[in-house]
Interface confidence: low
């Protein structure tokens, strides 16, 4: 069965749910925890053995319009002498987030949810070595 | 998507702000990307600042499963495979947006929620405070 039969609805208070047209959902974009802030250690992007830079992408038809992406500065990692060690690899760490995309169709506008992959920083890893026979 | 008529005359001026409430299509673009970090890479084991991944599940949220990283050590793994306490493993945190069912249990009414997740760990030089 595609949808559970009446009496087996998963939702405990369907009468209190707002009516929504088929094929869509109602989304309040007033963000819960809007003022929450990241409490990361200071300047870790510069102090890391796999340092990274940040760039901001901006799109007025996306909510939120600003998305910050990290890029690893080096292929290798920074050793104790401050030099790049290419026997190790700086690799990006990624995380998915949701955004709302606004699309214009003639004089109408529609909204679509989209998963976006954000690079949040870099870590230093031992490389995988493939031995050729 | 679900189309919403614009102002009469369809002016060229772009609406700078998104409306507080929008109707969105149920189909999420890129929804089928791999969301399990254990399957997408083994960086959490190969890193000099390795981490464990903890699964957090909440059916009132989309996505219902989110993975949280916890650094395994205070220090970092050196070339000999030992923990070097002259360096620090620190979590990389990121704010992400998820959907929260609002009112609770409603099938197709959501609100955006900002949550803070630790995505992985990185090895950093410590900040040394010299006492005068």
């Amino acid at each position: 069965r595609k949808i559970p039969k009446v009496g087996h609805t998963f939702f405990q208070k369907p009468e209190s749910c707002p009516p929504v047209p088929g094929g869509s959902m109602k989304l309040d974009i007033g963000i819960i925890n809007e003022n929450q802030r990241v409490s990361m250690s200071r300047n870790i992007e510069s102090r890391s053995t796999s340092p990274w830079n940040y760039t901001v992408t901006w799109d007025p038809n996306r909510y939120p319009s600003e998305v910050v992406q990290a890029q690893c500065r080096n292929l290798g990692c920074i050793n104790a002498q401050g030099k790049e060690d290419i026997s190790m690899n700086s690799v990006p760490i990624q995380q998915e987030t949701l955004v709302v995309r606004r699309k214009h169709q003639g004089c109408s506008v529609s909204f679509q949810l989209e998963k976006v992959l954000v690079t949040v920083g870099c870590t230093c890893v031992t490389p995988v070595i493939h031995h050729v026979q | 998507g679900i189309t919403i008529p614009r102002n009469p005359g369809c002016p060229n001026s772009e609406d700078k702000n998104f409306p507080r409430t929008v109707m969105v299509n149920l189909n999420i673009h890129n929804r089928n990307t791999n969301t399990n970090p254990k399957r997408s890479s083994d960086y959490y084991n190969r890193s000099t600042s390795p981490w464990n991944l903890h699964r957090n599940e909440d059916p009132e949220r989309y996505p219902s499963v989110i993975w949280e990283a916890k650094c395994r050590h205070l220090g970092c793994i050196n070339a000999d495979g030992n923990v070097d306490y002259h360096m620090n493993s620190v979590p990389i945190q990121q704010e992400i947006l998820v959907l929260r069912r609002e009112p609770p249990h409603c099938p197709n009414s959501f609100r955006l929620e900002k949550i803070l997740v630790s995505v992985g760990c990185t090895c950093v030089t410590p900040i040394v405070h010299h006492v005068a």
Partner: nanobody, 119 residues
Framework: EVQLVESGGGLVQPGGSLRLSCAAS????????MYWVRQAPGKGLEWVAS????????YYVDSVKGRFTISRDNAKKSLFLQMNSLRAEDTAVYYC????????????WGQGTLVTVSS
């Protein structure tokens, strides 16, 4: 056609045990997260437990943690729920469910198996 068929329910005394099974067909079982949900008399459905595609991770609602164990056998396309230390409040129809979809939690359900815990 997708089918989920539960079995193993019945009448059991408080403190007793039951093992529920769910036989799946019509889809690639090993590709989906699977769930057990339950509906107590006169109540809405409650999510009970879930298990990842490869069985590597399980998750439980607080009220059953330490008493229930979810498992799966991908080769046999089967989902299981081992229920120990059963309580009267565990009385419900138990359903297995497949996947996650917006806006619903689950896109396919079984017909359910009744578990009654009573002395």
């Amino acid at each position: 056609e997708v089918q989920l068929v539960e079995s193993g329910g019945g009448l059991v005394q408080p403190g007793g045990s039951l093992r529920l099974s769910c036989a799946a067909s019509g889809f690639t079982f090993s590709s989906y997260r699977m769930y057990w949900v339950r509906q107590a008399p006169g109540k809405g459905l409650e999510w009970v437990a879930s298990i990842e595609q490869d069985g590597s991770e399980e998750y439980y609602v607080d009220s059953v943690k330490g008493r229930f164990t979810i498992s799966r056998d991908n080769a046999k396309k089967s989902l299981f729920l081992q229920m120990n230390s059963l309580r009267a409040e565990d009385t419900a129809v138990y359903y297995c469910a497949k996947g996650e979809i917006l806006p619903l939690y689950f896109d396919y359900w079984g017909q359910g198996t009744l578990v009654t815990v009573s002395s």
